[in-house]
Structure formats: structure tokens, C-alpha cells
């Protein structure tokens, strides 16, 4: 972590493992006004590499609902509506932070967890390996 | 939030605002083995809607480094390498959770924050508005 000088106005930590365990205010400050990804844009349908959004729910996690993108096709959609296998639809993945209840079912104790989620799909040129 | 029965093995919370403020263990449990997005895949270069990755750093935030995608073109790249402006490169955005130091510079006190990041780009058919 980054070493930051202790500020006299900071809350005191009595945790012996400090700074491994910290206090987190769950009143989320939202820096944007985005909504459910299904409503926020129709890119998933208009893309040449369209995707479906699957709801992943886990009450032991915060956020409990995460939307996972799955590419509809292995190829990419051309202007005439045909799927072209000379190009490939692939998921764009991102590592995100979530809070995992630990111990399980505890309402006020969490552990940070990194998970990999697919956010959408993009169309790429494949790397072709021919047999000699 | 979801009402979950209190487990006798849970840490005790003495915060008057419970469950608004919770304890979070920062020993991250990593559910995947992903690395820096620049190394983990070359989709950003092979895509028909290629993007550049910009490093966004903020020591008051955890994680302090976030990679932001910016589409290289307004149009999409064709097989011959030319950009087709009948199609549009657009950013795929995702809302992610970060921890913001609050009060500022405090090493053990955070507030959850939602931010919108661009993860990559996809090629979409534009919505054409004709003038009547």
C-alpha cells in the first residue's frame, strides 16, 4: 500500500493487524448516474459482437447482483446479418473489487475480493495457426 | 441491504451507525489470476474498435491505479486497415466499487464509492436520424 502520513483527525484504529482491517462507510458516494447495464445502453444488441447479460446473484457479496456478459456468437455480425467466422467475438474482461461477507452471514464484517467479470464483447481478428 | 440473521461468531460492531460502517479485511482474496490488462490480452490492438489504455492514478483511492480505455477511432477498422465511418467505435462502460479515503489521507478509514470506467471498445451500427 501507499504510505500516507497519519492525520490527527483520522479515526483511531485499535485493530492489532492495522492497517489490514479498516473501517468502511457503506453510504456509497456515486460519481455517476448509471443504471442497470441492460437499460443504460443498447450496445449489447447493436454491436458486431453482440452479447447477452446474465444476472449473477450472491447474497454473501456486495454488490449482491453483478451482470455478466456472454458473447452471442463465436464470429462477428456483418452488415447483412450474417455471422462471419473470419472474425471472432471475444469478451472484454475486467477485474473488480467486491466485498465478501466474512465470516459468512455476518452483516458488518467483510473481506475485499477481486473477481473477473465480462463487461461486453468486441470483435477481433483471429490469430490463425495452420497445420504444416 | 439484505437482512441476514446475526451469527454468534461475527465480530461485534460498536459503531452507533451500524450497519452503515463496517470492518473490511484488506487482505484481498483473488478469485482469478489476471494481470495488468495491457499484458493479459492484446484485444485492444486486434479489435475492429481498438482502444488505448490510460493510467488513472489517485493515492486517495483504493485501488490507486485504474486503467481507462479510450477508443482510437470514431469508426471501426475494416479488414483492409481502413476506418469505416458507417460503423461506430464506442466505449463499454462499467460501474465499479472503489474505496475512497475519508477523511482524506487517513490510512484506515474509507468510504465506498461507485465510479464509471471504460473497459474497452466495441463496434456498433449507428442510430441514423434522418431529417424529415
Amino acid at each position: 500500500g501507499i504510505a500516507i502520513p497519519r492525520n490527527s483527525g483520522c479515526p483511531n484504529s485499535e485493530d492489532k493487524n492495522f492497517p489490514r482491517t479498516v473501517m468502511v462507510n457503506l453510504n456509497i458516494h456515486n460519481r455517476n448516474t448509471s443504471t442497470n447495464p441492460k437499460r443504460s445502453s443498447d450496445y449489447y444488441n447493436r454491436s458486431t459482437s453482440p452479447w447477452n447479460l446474465h444476472r449473477n446473484e450472491d447474497p454473501e457479496r456486495y454488490p449482491s447482483v453483478i451482470w455478466e456478459a456472454k458473447c452471442r456468437h463465436l464470429g462477428c455480425v456483418k452488415a447483412d446479418g450474417n455471422v462471419d467466422y473470419h472474425m471472432n467475438s471475444v469478451p472484454i474482461q475486467q477485474e473488480i473489487l467486491v466485498l465478501r461477507r466474512e465470516p459468512r452471514h455476518c452483516p458488518n464484517s467483510f473481506r475485499l475480493e477481486k473477481i473477473l467479470v465480462s463487461v461486453g464483447c468486441t470483435c477481433v481478428t483471429p490469430i490463425v495457426h495452420h497445420v504444416a | 441491504g439484505i437482512a441476514i440473521p446475526r451469527n454468534s461468531g461475527c465480530p461485534n460492531s460498536e459503531d452507533k451507525n451500524f450497519p452503515r460502517t463496517v470492518m473490511v479485511n484488506l487482505n484481498i482474496h483473488n478469485r482469478n489470476t489476471s494481470t495488468n490488462p495491457k499484458r493479459s490480452s492484446d484485444y485492444y490492438n486486434r479489435s475492429t474498435s481498438p482502444w488505448n489504455l490510460h493510467r488513472n492514478e489517485d493515492p486517495e483511492r483504493y485501488p490507486s491505479v485504474i486503467w481507462e480505455a479510450k477508443c482510437r477511432h470514431l469508426g471501426c477498422v475494416k479488414a483492409d486497415g481502413n476506418v469505416d465511418y458507417h460503423m461506430n467505435s464506442v466505449p463499454i462502460q462499467q460501474e465499479i466499487l472503489v474505496l475512497r479515503r475519508e477523511p482524506r489521507h487517513c490510512p484506515n478509514s474509507f468510504r465506498l464509492e461507485k465510479i464509471l470506467v471504460s473497459v474497452g471498445c466495441t463496434c456498433v451500427t449507428p442510430i441514423v436520424h434522418h431529417v424529415a
Epitope: 463465436l74 464470429g75 477481433v124 | -
Partner: antibody, heavy 120, light 111 residues
Framework: QVQLKESGPGLVAPSQSLSITCTIS????????VHWVRQPPGKGLEWLVV???????TYNSALKSRLSITRDNSKSQVFLKMNSLQTDDTAIYYC??????????????WGQGTPVTVSS | DVVMTQTPLSLPVSLGDQASISCRSS???????????LHWYLQKPGQSPKLLIY???NRFSGVPDRFSGSGSGTDFTLKISRVEAEDLGVYFC????????FGGGTKLEIK
């Protein structure tokens, strides 16, 4: 349960066109793709065409000029039309469901097939 | 198009024996997403094909565990650990990484 059933004319004269219908049940055409595959007598399988859950299509490039695939979601039917038939188009024609929603991208359930003979 | 070559063309076996069928593709079947879309089907006499194995090594629902798939890139194998009478028929490999193609088939028959 998942079922697919092909129905066709059985006999087609050379140079004429073939129309076959696949009627499905147990799943929705807006969630799963449907393929057409044929098998000449005593030979292997030849993939023809697929119509995906979103209505997009993929054709066998060697046969594309002769093939057309459409569907009627409300009737749960997929239609194959093939033009300019010759004797070597004699085969059993199968429709098969694509495992689209499970993302295996393969044909997980098949109809029993409909035999088509091209002869004058 | 990708050419799928199966060997042998015919495989005579005794019941209870292990059987092994090979499938080779003219191009790598690894998709840009990292998955390999190689599948195996069994067509019993007078029936339509049935899916056995999807994505190289995953058994489809209801398929006995005596069937196993392996391989990578361009070389793949289907193994039947102990052949039973109901396993007789023609086995086809198929790929969907590129536009769909099938192998020529391998006939499993009693020795």
C-alpha cells in the same frame, strides 16, 4: 422436453427447389439457434446453415447461393429453402438445436430427420 | 473451410475393450476467447446423431463416464474405456471454432 421435428416433400424433381420445415418445442427460438445438417445415404454429415437466437445467420459458403433460412417465432418453426436441386442433394435432412444459451456452440439436440430424394 | 480428419475409418472391438478414435483439424481450434470448440457425436444405426462430448472434454448430460475426450490445438481423441453393445455406431467429431464442419466418421463395430 426439447423436441425438433422435420417435415418435407420426400421427393423433388431435379432443378426444382426444396422447402423443409422444422417445428420445435421445449425451447424458444429467441433463446436458441437452429441448424440444418444433411447426410447423403451411407455418408457423413454436412453442415448447411444456422439461424441464431437473434435472427442472424451463418451459411456454408459452398452452398450459400442456393440456401435460405427463415423462421416464425410465434409458430416455433424454422424453414429451409434450397434451390436448383441435383441428384447429389439426395440425403436425410436434419434440424438441430444450438446450445446457444449454454455457450457450448454445438448442436445438442437433433430431430429424427426427413429423407429427401432428388429424382425425375 | 477447416478440414476434420478422423482415424480410423473403421474400428473393430471386443465388448469390454477400450476404444480410441482420433480427430485432427487442418487449423488450430483454439478460439480467440481461449476456448476450444471440438465436439463428439454418436450416430447409432437408423438414428439421428447424439451429442456425447462438447468443448474437447465435457460430457453432455446423461452420457456415461466411460466416454472421455482429450486433446488440444489440432489433435483430439475420444476414448471409450469399456465398450458396451449400445456404444456401437458411427462417431463424428465436429468443430465450431470456425464455420461448422464434421469429420468423416469412425464406425465402431464388433470384432
Amino acid at each position: 422436453q426439447v423436441q425438433l421435428k422435420e417435415s418435407g416433400p420426400g421427393l423433388v424433381a431435379p432443378s426444382q427447389s426444396l422447402s423443409i420445415t422444422c417445428t420445435i418445442s421445449g425451447f424458444s427460438l429467441t433463446s436458441y439457434g437452429v441448424h440444418w445438417v444433411r447426410q447423403p445415404p451411407g455418408k457423413g454429415l454436412e453442415w448447411l446453415v444456422v439461424i441464431w437466437s437473434d435472427g442472424t445467420t451463418t451459411y456454408n459458403s459452398a452452398l450459400k447461393s442456393r440456401l435460405s433460412i427463415t423462421r416464425d417465432n410465434s409458430k416455433s418453426q424454422v424453414f429451409l429453402k434450397m434451390n436448383s436441386l441435383q441428384t447429389d442433394d439426395t440425403a436425410i435432412y436434419y434440424c438441430a438445436r444450438d446450445s446457444t444459451w449454454d455457450y457450448y456452440y454445438t448442436m445438442d439436440y437433433w430431430g429424427q430427420g426427413t429423407p429427401v430424394t432428388v429424382s425425375s | 473451410d477447416v478440414v476434420m480428419t478422423q482415424t480410423p475409418l473403421s474400428l473393430p472391438v471386443s465388448l469390454g475393450d477400450q476404444a480410441s478414435i482420433s480427430c485432427r483439424s487442418s487449423q488450430s481450434l483454439v478460439h480467440s476467447n481461449g476456448n476450444t470448440y471440438l465436439h463428439w457425436y454418436l450416430q447409432k444405426p437408423g438414428q439421428s446423431p447424439k451429442l456425447l462430448i462438447y468443448k474437447v472434454s465435457n460430457r453432455f448430460s446423461g452420457v456415461p463416464d466411460r466416454f472421455s475426450g482429450s486433446g488440444s490445438g489440432t489433435d483430439f481423441t475420444l476414448k471409450i474405456s469399456r465398450v458396451e453393445a449400445e456404444d456401437l455406431g458411427v462417431y463424428f467429431c465436429s468443430q465450431s471454432t470456425h464455420v461448422y464442419t464434421f469429420g468423416g466418421g469412425t464406425k465402431l463395430e464388433i470384432k
